[in-house]
Amino acid sequence: AITEAREEAKPYPLFPGPLPGSLQTDHTSLLSLPHTSGYQPALMFSPTQPGRPYTGNVAIPRVTSAGSKLLPPLAFKHTVGHIILSEHKDVKFNCSISVPNIYQDTTISWWKDGKELLGAHHAITQFYPDDEVTAIIASFSITSVQRSDNGSYICKMKINNEEIVSDPIYIEVQGLPHFTKQPESMNVTRNTAFNLTCQAVGPPEPVNIFWVQNSSRVNEQPEKSPSVLTVPGLTEMAVFSCEAHNDKGLTVSKGVQINIKAIPSPPTEVSIHNSTAHSILISWVPGFDGYSPFRNCSVQVKEVDPLSNGSVMIFNTSASPHMYQIKQLQALANYSIGVSCMNEIGWSAVSPWILASTTEGAPSVAPLNVTVFLNESRDNVDIRWMKPLTKRQAGELVGYRISHVWQSAGISKELLEEVGQNNSRAQISVQVHNATCTVRIAAVTKGGVGPFSDPVKIFIPAHGWVDHAPSSTPAPGNADPVLII
């Protein structure tokens, strides 16, 4: 169908104001532009209201070359004021003006909301010359309009350094409802009420909302947007969506899954990363969280020993990182380790148990009966001790570490010696005369160095002094031993 209206040529075109002469353009081509010399080209809208002349921005032409008469002011003829159309439809609208033939080089440009429309738009200007005037029709077409095409469109014509501006054509694009708020996926407690929100806008308004649960409509009567659906509670997972309806049709929101919170699945892949004598570093892969964030985890440790009482040590830790260092363990012991995690609903089952062992420990006691004496003829110090009574967990004795500190006139020097496990005596060279030598001994296993014995002091005189009296580890409670010569 062609919408066409004819307007007589008048020196002052009637201007009825921006009457909402909008065209519904869903099924019509807006403009047909045949030209016959007997009338002005077709306009989109034939105003029915009483009008008035233009009073605004018009170009006043100069006197003609003959100097005989003035030409009428130039102004665009009034066209449709408002076009309402659906998204994805095509639209075509126009500006028309009659220009006396004395004018040359007229150019028409299209503007939208104050910005010139350049490039990828379909703007066509057609000229229809007559004896005295040329009718100019500038058409603008948009294929498959989008909401972003909404706006106020005007024509501008440059003529003799004058700018003539048309009245605006308001383009209002309507379409299917557009969601401004869609329901969100949620994790809910079983049989507990929750809300879902859906909001959609036009134009056109109003927008009505239907809720859908697992493909079935929830509400028989539509609700005006925005709509809040209160679900009294679920016992199993469900999928919800909302339908937004307006005069143009319906839009369906994304489907969202509503999950029921449950206890987590047990952790998997408990792994040993590092073992020491008294600690084990473990990690695990969390199980499924049951649609509720993990709060914390529990590491359970049982000693694997027929003689142990089978008690379980429990260590609580944060859920992240999925790693924990179990401390305060016995050296050279075997343990069974499991992990369980909890969310707001409860604790998971325990992971599969894994076996882990601690390594040898360092000795827990120092060598006994340490004695020190000076062998002046050889210029060395003899040291003797008794092997400490170490526990099995400390592991096999591999040797001893001897610390000897030499102090003289404000100078102090510490030296360390390592001796094998079969020894229970050692000799060290005198480092400084006229000095005090302080000796301490520690037992060493693969698990590390044990505690040092209490210090034993011996005075090393200047050359020529002789003393064979030993210095030895004191009985408990005595002052530090010092050999006095």
Partner: antibody, heavy 118, light 112 residues
Framework: QVQLQQSGPELVKPGTSVKISCKAS????????IHWVKQRPGQGLDWIGW????????QYNEKFKGKATLTADTSSSTAYMQLSSLTSEDSAVYYC???????????WGQGTSVTVSS | DAVMTQTPLSLPVSLGDQASISCRSS???????????LHWYLQKPGQSPQLLIY???NRFSGVQDRFSGSGSGTDFTLKISRVEAEDLGVYFC?????????FGSGTKLEIK
Amino acid sequence: QVQLQQSGPELVKPGTSVKISCKASGYSFTSYYIHWVKQRPGQGLDWIGWIFPGNRNTQYNEKFKGKATLTADTSSSTAYMQLSSLTSEDSAVYYCARLGLIYALDYWGQGTSVTVSS
Amino acid sequence: DAVMTQTPLSLPVSLGDQASISCRSSQSLENSNGHTYLHWYLQKPGQSPQLLIYRVSNRFSGVQDRFSGSGSGTDFTLKISRVEAEDLGVYFCLQVTHVPFTFGSGTKLEIK
């Protein structure tokens, strides 16, 4: 966001003229009609007319022809209404409003009170 | 001119009640294109009018869904489903189909 800021209250003498302003912001001033509306104390609303700033075309309600003159300054995005030969009947609050794409007066100025008193 | 007759002049309501305002035009407001340019406004005390409903039934952006409009031709209705304290003020209809544009005389919504 669209805003229309009107000039302050006016106290004028009968027989004189007054010019009130409406400064637009937040949209293309030259692309949308500006309408003017009169509201007398405790009474309804009366449409005065419109101006299209893009080309300064105007349309008046017959009741206000000769009383109101509408102009626009595009460089400052300001519309003006001059009221002449003022009488006590012209004492009112005058609003400017934009005719939006939906062809409704979608945004309004805060109003300018004009009091005509000797 | 298209004369807009609005009723009632005053509408006392209790909060939470439904309110209904009528606007009747002396001539049809349907344009040749089939659209009807009848709008509803609320003017709160000491404020400018604010647009509620445009073209009979379309809610303007930000307007609560309590407000709805209906009608055609010459008879139009604005409904407020559950009146709240912030809804109090004077309601106007406005037609922009015919020049001059004309307003209804206003309906004052007040608490009983």
